[in-house]
């Protein structure tokens, strides 16, 4: 008789999750010489240990500490790019501008990007059927706590000028409930970070509005200023041209506003 299984509102663990994490780890450590010392089996063992046999609504940052320790990585603190609701463009940017880093360019971010996982309380099983949804079920689920933990650490490490890419096509360009708005903004260290520079990415070709004047951007400016960090904002009217100019800065068309 099959044992009763908790039904959650979110999708279940990603198919072949263990193999995906292990393979990503091997690939990352091969590409990044500074992480060659990392033993991927140990990293995966620590990852497993964070959520297996634990109630998927009762995960804590402490559960992820062994994984955080193994995945400790130094990125240039003045080359950090945060993003909110515009991941693909942020990643395209750091693929071209190789000296800048998003969270997903670090080992731990790379391992978990786009994956879902959860276990079951009192069984050592991975739940491939369903996992808790942040809104409908609980916020202290394995995926949300992971991203909260790594995002906090990433923001804490930042220094000098920190950039953030924001999606100008959304009704809330800056969303206080996003990971950026709820975690990263509050963990930038004023004694290390001089300026947060927002890049507001426009969606429509004919959109010439100054989205830096958007009420939610003003709200972000207020939060940042209260934390004794300077704030600046730039409109990126043509993201396609923006990327092209990052690739080829000498191009004559790259002197005009993008």
């Amino acid at each position: 008789v099959p044992r009763w299984r908790q039904q959650w509102s979110g999708p279940g663990t990603t198919k072949r999750f263990p193999e995906t994490v292990l393979a990503r780890c091997v690939k990352y450590t091969e590409i990044h010489p500074e992480m060659r010392h990392v033993d991927c089996q140990s990293v995966w063992d620590a990852f497993k240990g964070a959520f297996i046999s634990k109630h998927p609504c009762n995960i804590t940052e402490e559960d992820y500490q062994p994984l955080m320790k193994l995945g400790t990585q130094t990125v240039p603190c003045n080359k950090i790019l945060l993003w909110s609701r515009i991941k693909d463009l942020a990643h395209q940017f750091t693929q071209v501008q190789r000296d800048m880093f998003t969270l997903e360019d670090t080992l731990l971010g790379y391992l978990a990007d786009d994956l879902t996982w959860c276990g079951e309380f009192n069984t050592s099983k991975i739940n491939y059927q369903s996992c808790p949804d942040w809104r409908k079920d609980c916020s202290n689920n394995p995926v949300s706590v992971f991203w909260k933990t790594v995002s906090r650490r990433f923001a804490e490490a930042a220094c000098d000028v920190v950039h953030v890419m924001l999606n100008g096509s959304r009704s809330k360009i800056f969303d206080k409930n996003s990971t950026f708005g709820s975690v990263e903004v509050h963990n930038l260290q004023p004694e290390k970070v001089q300026t947060l520079e927002a890049w507001v990415i426009h969606g429509g070709r004919e959109d010439s509005r100054d989205l830096c004047q958007d009420p939610t951007i003003k709200e972000l400016e207020s939060i940042i200023s209260k934390r004794n960090i300077q704030f600046s904002c730039k409109n990126i009217y043509r993201p396609d041209k923006f990327l092209q100019c990052v690739k080829n800065p000498e191009d004559s068309s790259c002197t005009s506003e993008i």
Partner: antibody
């Protein structure tokens, strides 16, 4: 019936190579991490290789790293161990073993083959 | 590496006796311990995993226990067919390691 059958063992000179095979039947082979475990003449057990369910990930202890290669063919339900630069200390009974769980690497072995003997001697 | 020590290489017992086979880990392995039985001329067979979970089809006279660094396999009433080598193994951290084995002999 769940079964693992090893083959390919034999006598080989130091520095030589050998390829072991393991034919799996009676279960969904592609759902399981698989292992090679060896037993020395003194009866000590040591795992020598692991491969993930889809075959993308492999891992070895330092004692065989760079000399042994584990691979699998999920279409044929076969597991392999290519051994090269063999040493006298590789002399052992080699077992193909299945992971005890089908959702991740549990690292305990619930099905073992009968084994195939590898002797490295000049 | 975690060393798994089975201090008794041999144990002698009689049919019907209760026997305890012990295993000590060099560090805490968080109950991630498996036990195997290997009868003469055969391959090892899984008896117990996660220190106390009996594998399917294993007679209930076999019981696993322990936590931290100390683990035991208990056979409540030894049968003649239990003559075998018994191995513990930690499935906690890399590299996974086995104990040296305990040979159970029937008087």
């Amino acid at each position: 019936e769940v079964q693992l059958v090893e083959s390919g063992g034999g006598l080989v000179k130091p520095g030589g190579s050998l390829k072991l095979s393991c034919a799996a039947s009676g279960f969904t082979f592609s759902d399981y991490f698989m292992y090679w475990v060896r037993q020395t003449p003194e009866k000590r057990l040591e795992w020598v290789a692991i491969i993930s369910d889809g075959g993308i990930y492999t891992y070895y202890p330092d004692s065989v790293k760079g000399r042994f290669t584990i691979s699998r063919d999920n279409a044929k339900n076969n597991l392999y161990l290519q051994m090269s630069s063999l040493k006298s200390e590789d002399t052992a009974m080699y077992y193909c073993a299945r992971d005890g769980r089908d959702d991740y690497d549990g690292w305990y072995f619930d099905v073992w083959g009968a084994g195939t003997t590898v002797t490295v001697s000049s | 590496d975690i060393v798994m020590t089975q201090s008794h290489k041999f144990m002698s017992t009689s049919v019907g006796d209760r026997v305890n086979i012990t295993c000590k880990a060099s560090q805490d392995v968080n109950t991630a311990v498996a036990w195997y039985q290997q009868k003469p001329g055969q391959s090892p067979k899984l008896l117990i995993y996660w220190a106390s979970t009996r594998h399917a089809g294993v007679p209930d006279r076999f019981t696993g226990s322990g936590s931290g660094t100390d683990y035991a396999l208990t056979i409540s009433s030894v049968q003649a067919e239990d003559l075998a080598l018994y191995y513990c193994q930690q499935h906690y951290s890399t590299p996974r390691t086995f104990g040296g084995g305990t040979k159970l002999e029937i008087k």
